[in-house]
Interface confidence: medium
């Protein structure tokens, strides 16, 4: 079969938006199945026509209503003849139009008076493409070949830049890039002490506006009174906007404040936030826990615990815990150093412990007291020890 692209030179140049019809002539076949191929892929759309000129001469048409850059490429037609695929000579379709931007100026944030660069690149066809830069509504510099880099020595306020690309088909304007001025960050806010213990405090905050420069770190300053001597200053990388303050003194009033810094410098400090560390739990266990059996039940007594350090704060009440081997157990809280125990089974062994508590919690448990079901009273000692008299 004779196969050729009709009326089409090896290179076909068309303006963007114009229609194109590619004609493929097939001779020597009665029923050719003409396929159009672009850059190696069969064209799947329905913009195709087949016309019999005579019994053995056919013309196929590929019709493009409005060509765009993506239609550019290498086209050919092909037919199957006797199990073999015959292909025509190709035609290169070039789509000409106004320049097409491959690189447009990007938004920037720069320090005042700092030098920076903006880039712009556009392509044809047709070439050459020249670039003209605009600063706001003012043209800056003459045409330069694409690609073009604009070097700016610095700006003192937010400024808009754009580039314009020219070729024989006309001009295209890029996006407008805004060059923002960087500034010091704003003070952080919503500063919260999220967790407190006797010696540690977790702090979280929200960053203020970053001044269009990446926040690099935040400083947490701690004093024992607002404006007092600095006890602690912790510099933390961010994000996250959190900090753990360690080695604080228990049961102490503190204040903290936070500031954050970008490449230009630190923000103002936020307002002081007061907080108080928790005190220490009692360090000592009640001593000399003993029991006295009475007709009405069991009286338990122990020695009063004296605070070892002022950080423990006021002590009391005492917490009493008892358990029996039948599974019965209970706790009761008493203000003094004596408790009347009821509701226990005298026929079963009883184990009793006591601790002293404060605002933080309970101190260590006393040695357990075992009251045997045979005993009339009991003494402190290791579990399961029995004392009789």
């Amino acid at each position: 079969a004779g196969l050729k692209l009709m009326g089409a030179p090896v290179k076909l140049t068309v303006s963007q938006g114009q229609p194109v019809k590619l004609n493929c002539s097939v001779e020597g076949m009665e029923e050719p199945d003409i396929q159009w191929v672009k850059d190696g892929a069969v064209v799947q759309n329905l913009d195709q026509l087949y016309i019999p000129v005579s019994e053995q001469h056919w013309i196929g048409f590929l019709s493009l209503k409005s060509v765009e850059r993506s239609d550019a490429g290498r086209y050919w037609c092909q037919v199957e003849d006797g199990g073999e695929t015959e292909i025509s000579q190709p035609v290169w379709l070039t789509v000409e139009g106004v320049p097409f931007f491959t690189v447009e100026p990007k938004d920037l944030a720069v320090p005042p008076n700092a030098p920076f660069q903006l880039s712009c690149e556009a392509v044809g066809p047709p070439e050459p493409v020249t670039i003209v830069w605009w600063r706001g509504t003012t043209k800056i510099g003459g045409p330069a070949p694409s690609p073009s880099v604009l070097n700016v020595t610095g700006v003192t306020q937010s400024t808009m830049f754009s580039c314009e690309a020219h070729n024989l088909k006309g001009l295209a304007s890029s996006r407008t890039a805004t060059v923002h001025l960087q500034a010091l960050p704003a003070a952080p806010f919503n500063i919260t002490v999220t967790k407190l213990s006797s010696s540690n405090a977790s702090v979280a905050w929200m960053p203020g506006a970053d001044g269009r420069a990446l926040l690099q770190s935040c400083t947490v300053q701690v004093t024992q009174a607002p404006g007092g001597w600095e006890v602690l200053a912790v510099v933390v990388p961010v994000p996250p906007f959190t900090c753990l303050l360690r080695d604080l003194v228990p049961a102490t009033n503190y204040s903290l404040r936070v500031r954050c810094a970008n490449a230009l410098g630190p923000s103002p400090y936020a307002d002081w936030v007061p907080f108080q560390t928790k005190g220490l739990a009692p360090a000592s266990a009640p001593q000399n826990l003993h029991a006295i059996r009475t007709d009405s039940g069991l009286i338990l007594e122990w020695e009063e615990v004296i605070p070892e350090a002022p950080l423990e704060g006021p002590l009391g009440p005492y917490k009493l815990s008892w358990v029996q081997d039948n599974g019965t157990q209970d706790e009761l809280t008493v203000e003094g150093t004596r408790a009347n125990l009821t509701g226990w089974d005298p026929q079963k062994d009883l184990i009793v412990r006591v601790c002293v508590s404060n605002a933080v919690g309970c101190g260590p448990w006393s040695q357990p007291l075992v009251v045997s079901s045979h005993d009339r009273a009991g003494q402190q000692g290791p579990p399961h020890s029995r004392t009789s008299w």
Partner: antibody, heavy 125, light 108 residues
Framework: EVQLVQSGADVKKPGASLTISCQAS????????ISWVRQKPGKGLEWMGV????????RYGPSFQGHVTISADRSTATAYLQWRSLEASDTAMYYC??????????????????WGPGTLVTVSS | SYELTQPPSVSVSPGQTARITCSGD??????AYWYQQKSGQAPVLVIY???KRPSGIPERFSGSSSGTMATLTISGAQVEDEADYYC???????????FGGGTKLTVL
């Protein structure tokens, strides 16, 4: 003279299968594409699909893909539209359409389309 | 799926110009075709490739396309032009056709 002769009107129950036909005469069948178009009573035209002139591939409209099958027999110059399971909503007039080009001065295409008279399909229980 | 949008109805007096529009996102790249369908008859192609007229179609029928809108114009509409008019084009990928919803032209 170009003619597209379509099969006669048909009444079917929902769930039944059906094939309607369109026989071409007056031109070489393989010169053109055959499309099928549906028109429900009192409604607009809907493009169903097309089979190319060599009966080697088909294209379907999204609403019809999987619901109908378009085929052709080159030896008898006949195109077919087939349903495996009809629904009441398939009640419509179905046109076959010859798509393609004629020669004007031998080389310049002029779009021209011949429509069959239509086949009325009624699906009712 | 792709849609072509037409006004449901257009009314003109005899001798006036009737304009029927068809909008679709792919129309900048795909040709529009126009069909006329009179009551009880099969459709007839009146415009192809946006603006071309098949032989036998009166000169008062013309077509144009701009951006996403195609327009069928009947200059000096006549009573016999009263019919339903359908635009017809391809989806953006070019792998199926679609009709517009149709416009009923009344020539009073």
């Amino acid at each position: 003279e170009v003619q597209l002769v379509q099969s006669g009107a048909d009444v079917k129950k929902p769930g039944a299968s059906l094939t309607i036909s369109c026989q071409a005469s007056g031109y070489t069948f393989t010169d053109y594409w055959i499309s099928w178009v549906r028109q429900k009573p009192g409604k607009g035209l809907e493009w169903m699909g097309v089979i190319n002139k060599y009966a080697s591939w088909t294209r379907y409209g999204p609403s019809f893909q999987g619901h109908v099958t378009i085929s052709a027999d080159r030896s008898t110059a006949t195109a077919y539209l087939q349903w495996r399971s009809l629904e009441a909503s398939d009640t419509a007039m179905y046109y076959c359409v010859r798509s393609g080009g004629l020669t004007s001065g031998g080389t310049i295409p002029e779009y021209y389309q011949h429509w069959g008279p239509g086949t009325l399909v009624t699906v009712s229980s | 799926s792709y849609e072509l949008t037409q006004p449901p109805s257009v009314s003109v007096s005899p001798g006036q110009t009737a304009r029927i529009t068809c909008s679709g996102d792919a129309l900048p790249k795909k040709y529009a075709y126009w069909y006329q369908q009179k009551s009880g008859q099969a459709p007839v192609l009146v415009i192809y490739e946006d603006s071309k007229r098949p032989s036998g179609i009166p000169e008062r029928f013309s077509g144009s396309s701009s951006g996403t809108m195609a327009t069928l114009t009947i200059s000096g509409a006549q009573v016999e032009d009263e019919a339903d008019y359908y635009c017809y084009s391809q989806n953006p990928q070019g792998n199926y056709f679609v009709f517009g919803g149709g416009t009923k032209l009344t020539v009073l």
